[in-house]
Amino acid sequence: AQNITARIGEPLVLKCKGAPKKPPQRLEWKLNTGRTEAWKVLSPQGGGPWDSVARVLPNGSLFLPAVGIQDEGIFRCQAMNRNGKETKSNYRVRVYQIPGKPEIVDSASELTAGVPNKVGTCVSEGSYPAGTLSWHLDGKPLVPNEKGVSVKEQTRRHPETGLFTLQSELMVTPARGGDPRPTFSCSFSPGLPRHRALRTAPIQPRVWEPVPLEEVQLVVEPEGGAVAPGGTVTLTCEVPAQPSPQIHWMKDGVPLPLPPSPVLILPEIGPQDQGTYSCVATHSSHGPQESRAVSISIIEPGEEGPTAGSVGGSGLGTLALA
């Protein structure tokens, strides 16, 4: 069978090979399509409701004034010329419809580095056959389930027209320290070959780095935070930000009831001072920023000083602020 592709809504003419150019003709067309139960036979005489769908022209060709999805199928013509020689024509008709240009809807203006983000949803409306949607990053195809890329797809069919609407939702996890302004686009590839892809306008969300680049540092004296009973520990909170933010102190995750200060002195250390300490710098723009916690422990006489002590009681000894 010869493959024929026709655009939905357009006319189609199928030639009946070997048929005399004008009547009288001995020919018949047989159709097996979405409109027929089995094989439907059409003759040059025509007439009836089928004339609006398909009719035989004076030259023996079959004419379909406006091809639809239901016209997909097999078309066969059997003709006899004046000498009684029989010729058969066999066509496999497939129909297509190019959708409108795909669009990216619900697109994000900003993505957060290091976590999954919805980039947007690509929508293509009015295709036949369904076709496929694919995503591109900086012009290169994005492969789902690779490097933090995931795609959720949905295909719907219009109950009356039979045309397809495709949706593809893209989720990505941008790498920290990566491109701050990636370019995403989406393209529709038709289900039938020999038709070029349709591409959306690109989108360029910003990538936001959620982690402050410079840590709040907590410096302990003596180093390691292990001290003999009655000794003094000095904790200093170093914040790179300018202007200097307010610094509060925490012990075992609970704020200490002290005025803000970058230095915390624990004089005459006792068991009640043991625990995990951290400092919190408060910035107006990105809120509180906490240091890593350090462990303060007491070394009993004769013990080696550990590099990190165990968490002790929750009471507070005498505190001094520099």
């Epitope: 290091g114 976590v115 982690v211 995750g253 990105h286 809120g287 509180p288 906490e290």
Partner: nanobody, 118 residues
């Protein structure tokens, strides 16, 4: 992995209230600090509020102090942001966030839109 899913956003008149919820699931033991940030169209993302999971401390941006309250429900594994006396300038996408400590948030939700009309 920790998953954060925000809900409760919507359209509200100036002076009205909304309560945002952030459902926390996954490896929640790896997080101790939770917060809310927001981003208005064309503006930088900004801090709104943060708290310890145990409720021992909480922080608020100056712009929302006295109007917004952060809280949590341990049984439901949910963090809330109650927003009262809303103003048009509170219009933004609100993001829930979580991390080991304040300021270092490894996990972010997808955001929920809050629109305050005048």
């Amino acid at each position: 992995e920790v998953q954060l899913v925000e809900s409760g956003g919507g359209l509200v008149q100036a002076g009205g209230s909304l309560r945002l919820s952030c459902a926390v699931s996954g490896r929640t033991f790896s997080t101790d600090a939770f917060g809310w940030f927001r981003q208005a169209p064309g503006k930088e993302r900004e801090f709104v509020s943060a708290m310890r999971w145990n409720g021992s401390s909480s922080y608020y941006a100056d712009l929302v102090k006295g109007r917004f309250t952060i809280s949590r429900d341990n049984a439901k594994n949910t963090v809330y942001l109650l927003m009262n006396s809303l103003k048009p300038e509170d219009t933004a996408v609100y993001y829930c966030t979580a991390g080991k400590r304040y300021g270092y948030y490894d996990y972010w939700g997808q955001g929920t839109q809050v629109t305050v009309s005048s």
